[in-house]
Amino acid sequence: KIDACKRGDVTVKPSHVILLGSTVNITCSLKPRQGCFHYSRRNKLILYKFDRRINFHHGHSLNSQVTGLPLGTTLFVCKLACINSDEIQICGAEIFVGVAPEQPQNLSCIQKGEQGTVACTWERGRDTHLYTEYTLQLSGPKNLTWQKQCKDIYCDYLDFGINLTPESPESNFTAKVTAVNSLGSSSSLPSTFTFLDIVRPLPPWDIRIKFQKASVSRCTLYWRDEGLVLLNRLRYRPSNSRLWNMVNVTKAKGRHDLLDLKPFTEYEFQISSKLHLYKGSWSDWSESLRAQTPEEEPTGMLDVWYMKRHIDYSRQQISLFWKNLSVSEARGKILHYQVTLQELTGGKAMTQNITGHTSWTTVIPRTGNWAVAVSAANSKGSSLPTRINIMNLCEAGLLAPRQVSANSEGMDNILVTWQPPRKDPSAVQEYVVEWRELHPGGDTQVPLNWLRSRPYNVSALISENIKSYICYEIRVYALSGDQGGCSSILGNSKHKAPLSGPHINAITEEKGSILISWNSIPVQEQMGCLLHYRIYWKERDSNSQPQLCEIPYRVSQNSHPINSLQPRVTYVLWMTALTAAGESSHGNEREFCLQGKAN
């Protein structure tokens, strides 16, 4: 009821707390001399449900039967309306609609750790919409009982604050929870358990790992546990993996040897504990220990490739390239690569350690038979050396793969296809597909990429270090013993018309014809592989269509003769470049007048 109603009363029957679906009677009555002055018969009492008028009556009291109230609290306010004045509040009352508590379900109790306290949880069931008090009762041997009450509205957890001890681990304890509100009460089914059933050990702590003689094969995990722990389970995984390896151990006494760890790998380790083979529950997982296993000497062999370049009649440049070992092969931090160059007949050998690079260039005589061996070293040792005899990779014409093609295959991929060489195809031991960005100057500093393909393959998809709108020089080598044949092609993964045309830098006259020289289009403006250049010319002040000459693109070419110009006529000349996607805009225009005699 609203406190201190001076003008009247509102009463609720049978109660101001009702079960959902019940009916209530609400009475509003005026106190003596609290009606309308002079016009007591004109008293108009109005009953509001919150702000909605639900009933009215002339006189000193009003009765109303109300049904269908929703769960929760509904406020009823009674007002008096007199002629020529505002309604005034007389009194009000709240009605609380709820339900009796349902039977609490799934009562379960645990004690966290041997020194912890017993705490229980349960499911309350549906909301009562009323203040509901929960009482938890625990009875044990020798008629011992403990009781705890919960004042929280949504109570589904209580801690007794008592500690069960392992003196009599088989003694039975029984817990029960009772819910009470204004509409009724209900108790859970009893839950009976022993010390071993409910004690959940604390997670193991102080986890450490030791590698004897810095070897991954002699690894022991150590930890600390509560005194009564019988079982442990260990889980571990490489830090970059989502899958755990699991191991169950009994009576481990805080140590376990791990035999299957990979070298030079960061692992995450966690441990959980349990007091009894089939009773009780596992502890939470311990905090993670992260540790890196020691290095082991590398396994596997480096993938090595090379390139030869003629310098002069007596010398050649050899550039060696190799790929990093995979993490699982390197088994540690690669400190250096050891390159040994040997002349096979004379036995001269030169060894060099390379750090920070995966390539090496040297100059050797063109005479003699040369071989190289390359290995990778970490703190524990070296990989087996990869040995290669240096040969002229393209010398055997009959071993050259045929009909090499390069086609764009989706974003930043090029599909290279070929036909086996004319010479007995079964002689091919492997194909090597090599690619690098095409630079007109033939720059040897441009990174080299390669992949190896089995002898029965006639295609390879290249995707490593492939950029859109860049032209690649692609070579396919067929290797057989110490012979090799090769074929090359230009290819790109994506192309469009070049952004600019070649810049004509000179026009010179030679015996009645002219020689046009130009600068190459910058690589970043070529927008793919160039197929042709076009040279256009027309008489200076003529409106006629220009004549043109189309020249197939060759990397090293940057001049071309034209012999169809008339003497003593001034011509305007310009150039364009074409990819498979189209023609560039004009390069610069140059004027030229041939001085030679007329025919």
Epitope: D3, G72, T73, D127, H129, Y131, I153, Y154
Partner: nanobody, 115 residues
Framework: QVQLQESGGGLVQPGGSLRLSCIAS????????MDWYRQAPGNQREWVAS???????YYDDSAKGRFTISRDNAKMTVYLQMNSLKPEDTAVYYC?????????WGQGTQVTVSS
Amino acid sequence: QVQLQESGGGLVQPGGSLRLSCIASGSIFSIYNMDWYRQAPGNQREWVASITPSGDPYYDDSAKGRFTISRDNAKMTVYLQMNSLKPEDTAVYYCKVPTEKGNYWGQGTQVTVSS
């Protein structure tokens, strides 16, 4: 035990605005209505507005269109935004939590509307 503390009252000119707050302690806040009442000098306490736990608001005719009640269950706070205030709104404003075990009232905050 539930305790309620109102704030935000003060002196304001006719037509002005005030925002009252009422902060509750105790866990029962989330299942009960929250109400605002007021008591002018010499009068009895009158209901002004209520809000249900799910946020449905109700107003007395004297507050409709001018006052807005709201609640923040996470902060256990109920608000009354009062606009277009009139001299007859002068009163002590109380917040209340009605429960089946009894009503909990705050101490009240004075609102004076005067030029």
